[in-house]
Amino acid sequence: ATSCPQNVNISGGTFTLSHGWAPGSLLIYSCPQGLYPSPASRLCKSSGQWQTPRATRSLTKAVCKPVRCPAPVSFENGIYTPRLGSYPVGGNVSFECEDGFILRGSPVRQCRPNGMWDGETAVCDNGAGHCPNPGISLGAVRTGSRFGHGDKVRYRCSSNLVLTGSAERECQGNGVWSGTEPICRQPYSYDFPEDVAPALGTSFSHMLGATNPTQRTKESLGRKIQIQRSGHLNLYLLLDSSQSVSENDFLIFKESASLMVDRIFSFEINVSVAIITFASEPKVLMSVLNVNSRDITEVISSLENAKYKDHENGTGTNTYAALNSVYLMMNNQMQLLGMKTMAWQEIRHAIILLTDGKSNMGGSPKTAVDQIREILNINQKRNDYLDIYAIGVGKLDVDWRELNELGSKKDGERHAFILQDTKALHQVFEHMLDVSKLTDTICGVGNMSANASDQERTPWHVTIKPKSQETCRGALISDQWVLTAAHCFRDGNDHSLWRVNVGDPKSQWGKEFLIEKAVISPGFDVFAKKNQGILEFYGDDIALLKLAQKVKMSTHARPICLPCTMEANLALRRPQGSTCRDHENELLNKQSVPAHFVALNGSKLNINLKMGVEWTSCAEVVSQEKTMFPNLTDVREVVTDQFLCSGTQEDESPCKGESGGAVFLERRFRFFQVGLVSWGLYNPCLGSADKNSRKRAPRSKVPPPRDFHINLFRMQPWLRQHLGDVLNFLPL
């Protein structure tokens, strides 16, 4: 059998083969960060010879060359230093403006290992035009220097750089430039996941009904709320499974798409998902016309059933046919719903194309995009009804021009990306969608990204304090109600002296609220069982506080989901007829359930809630506690089934001041409060004035640490009695 020669090493780099040394196999070179391979790949021909794309000679020696970033071609109304033909990785370029001009963007930019500049385009602007000066990105040349309403500017890139973004932009009536900023990049450059995730996420969040409060100062950013919760989104996932995609990479495409689907369903919008795999021909695995496209389990299942081998007979990359099958799907749906109906016109459409190369058959994919734009009547007014994300993976044969042509162009957003590999793609999809920026009272959303603040991660978390020192914690369960522990109020202080501190994006200290009323469980009496040798009893340790004003929802303040409510049911994506018992079964679904509480310093700490038969072994050590319970005869009188138990294994123990805080868990990227911190056998903060200092109990401690949390599933009648008109409760 024919095979290609094996003398294809690259000095300083490595290579992988898609199908061994056999004809049809793609050899892909890779180099350490800061270097790029030249050539990037070779293809084993049926003749047994390696072919290098776009090479004149049949076999050039492969080398790793240093990555460089493009130099500014011109910089208006200012100067830049140093002036070089191109810049090495780690090199800086600095910008200064002439008198009378203000610098917008980054004054210093550094060349990154992917051949891209960090920061934002520097612009020297005097604010004279109807639109701001759109600037000239590094490596670009602009024609057009008038910025009045209707004026156009055009861009091209110098030498062999590739333009991504809009080659032409127009100053619109609202003072915003049409399209998206053009960037000139090296053909071998690629995007880092940490850049793509927020860029993709910002765009996607806008489409999903999110404004981005952190960026409201830039008026060009933040399309207003697009999809109300009654709106509908059609999401079309197009997965390349052509020959150049290895089976392993195809699996990662699938996994990434699954992550995407999982996240998208965690927004409480109506969504239908189509799944199309393609090589020479497309294969529709799920159509938006199928009622199952609205059901996450069905969508994920059809994704899981996508087979790499489905396309083994046709191994080209026919992106046109894939996009055309989206067009046909749209056309069928339009016929079904009626072209003039709101039902059709109000559907928003998002296409995500995951590909590893450029289309090599079937004609220009741009033709299909034009048809799609036409059928959806995409014009300046309806621009928000279509988003096409073109994501190239693997630096090889991905065609920047084609990706750029396919991706949507929207101001302040990017829709075309190239990632180094499928691992990077996976990272992007993991961190891309952040529901925490939604402005309505959607519950249980915390920002999970690595750079989020503690309060953004747990925006329901509040501090309850009298005028003097902090005493307790609590959780927002609506925009005006806080759930906490009754024992925080056992001294009977006038609650008008108390304050509730709620997270606020404008202040690291949060915002103080007065308490309109405190509802303390009448069953709570810490001395109720004194005559049974139980000096302190925490049954019914639950209270509700109504704040004097409503809390404005933000990244820092948002309610947690309470189980057994419609709100939580939506977040869990459970069917409509679900009951409270269903929620308990889903949330407390193991003998040991990983959960969290929030520490005095705001960090999220881990515990394991012991359930079922393990609950008793967790709870029974209380009988060894002789200080709190000197003459205890029946441990069941202290630890009733109102309590959840933690404190075994490597669990953290809550401190005294953490009482009343939520005990919560994460499901489907949303957070649910199952308990509230009540009492325990060990205080890890005892004797420490430092909020960050906690001491673990010595292993020899008798009794060992145990912590008890009011189980919200056992407090349903009381919660329903007081929150019946605030939350929508499910049947028990």
């Epitope: 679904n589 038969v613 008793t616």
Partner: antibody, heavy 122, light 108 residues
Framework: QVQLRESGPGLMKPSETLSLTCTVS????????YYWTWIRQPPGKGLEWI?????????DYNPSLKSRVTISVDTSKNQFSLRLNSVSAADMAVYYC??????????????WGQATLVTVSS | SSELTQDPTVSVALGQTVRITCQGD??????ASWYQQKPGQAPVLVLY???NRPSGIPDRFSGSSSGNTASLTITGAQAEDEADYYC???????????FGGGTKLTVL
Amino acid sequence: QVQLRESGPGLMKPSETLSLTCTVSGGSVSSGVYYWTWIRQPPGKGLEWIGSMFYSGNADYNPSLKSRVTISVDTSKNQFSLRLNSVSAADMAVYYCARGYASGWSYYFDYWGQATLVTVSS
Amino acid sequence: SSELTQDPTVSVALGQTVRITCQGDSLRTYYASWYQQKPGQAPVLVLYGKNNRPSGIPDRFSGSSSGNTASLTITGAQAEDEADYYCNSRYSSGTHVVFGGGTKLTVL
């Protein structure tokens, strides 16, 4: 509404292996909060717990039967099964499958199957 | 010991109150659960925990516990309450369960 239904042979010969299956509808055997249980009742006598299984694979058995009994769960079919080796006349009983639930200090069986009578005779 | 002891038979006049008891060491740690079984039928859970009734069980059934003894009380016994009553509880670790020998309740 949760329903359990036992199935398996009614007549056995001594020393054979008894295999019973319980099919669960209206609920899932992979739910992590329940203990899928077999209980038997010899004619005219009281209830005897045979064993319980948690979907993750942990099983507990009556010490008097431990050497002969195996309980397993098949999540794909939403079923759990009982295997009792080397049956004898002493194993003749009505066999129930049931769903066990542990809450606080109590442990109870909230749903039962309709029962299957197993006769052992040579 | 892992035994639960019940009186084999108890009788009660219609409309009167009757108490059925269950004794065993495990009841010092765990609450008993109670089941009613009528001839030819599967047992039905009537009480669990300290004193909890599943939905559909009349409130004339109540439970209590003291030391190593658990009690099921029927206040105002009805003819349809005539049945065998079994108690059960966990013992030791895991899901080990023990049943009482059963009490046959006759309503006169």
